[in-house]
Amino acid sequence: VLEVYYTSLRCRCVQESSVFIPRRFIDRIQILPRGNGCPRKEIIVWKKNKSIVCVDPQAEWIQRMMEVLRKRSSSTLPVPVFKRKIP
């Protein structure tokens, strides 16, 4: 559900939303940390209706959701946190 990408590509998100999306409608969350080509952290959400949205990293709900997912993955529940390095 949660994926962290380290990438040298420029920013992916043109617009960001802070509108709440229930987790049941989310397929996966991609986190692009600040770095090289992009000066800000980006969060991309893939939804179950095949649409994609960039979420404001400051939105309280996404911070809460990521914290829950991290806790679940650290307690060995099958909600993996993937860390991939993309050159």
Epitope: P22, R24, F25, N49, L77, P78
Partner: antibody
Framework: EVQLVESGGGLVQPGGSLRLSCAVS????????MAWVRQAPGKGLEWVAS????????YYRDSVKGRFTISRDNAKNSLYLQMNSLRAEDTAVYYC??????????????WGQGTLVTVSS | DIQMTQSPSSLSASVGDRVTITCKAS??????LTWYQQKPGKAPKRLIY???ILQTGIPSRFSGSGSGTEYTLTISSLQPEDFATYFC????????FGQGTKLEIK
Amino acid sequence: EVQLVESGGGLVQPGGSLRLSCAVSGFTFSDYYMAWVRQAPGKGLEWVASINYDGGDTYYRDSVKGRFTISRDNAKNSLYLQMNSLRAEDTAVYYCATEEDYDGSYVMDAWGQGTLVTVSS
Amino acid sequence: DIQMTQSPSSLSASVGDRVTITCKASQNINKELTWYQQKPGKAPKRLIYNTNILQTGIPSRFSGSGSGTEYTLTISSLQPEDFATYFCLQQSSLYTFGQGTKLEIK
């Protein structure tokens, strides 16, 4: 008092169309995701479709994708389900339900009384 | 898609009995489970959400428990008004209801 009142059900031939409505009162409609759930006669419950706060995001069960369209009019406090290419297996009581607010504690909490859709020739 | 297997499909019991209904999910649903009661001709009524949180106004004889893939609804001492059909609902990934348990008077 929270109230959801469905209407628009009836008898329709296979291949036909119907539009269901759900009039809502007693809470701030635009603060909630909403859903349609159905129940075939004597059978269990089945989620049909969901819609986000402003109608910009919709979700459907596979068997109704491309045939049903969920929509809402926040100014009228109303939820809709446009049903096209109806099949016998769509025969059911259709309920509208509150689905989600911010913290998730209202998931499928309030329901309407249901409206019966019968697809038969 | 997540499948929900509810058991038993029907159950005969007497007033005062303790009754347990089980729902098994095809994968971990992280306690995102709701229980409903439905009487003939009526809409479902929410009893418990998030596995074990009692809906306001629901008697304390109803309780829920579980984690991972296995969840239970317990009625500690059946009352005449409890004879009805009970459904579980997973809300972890889209929505799936259990097939229902019809609770009848013995």
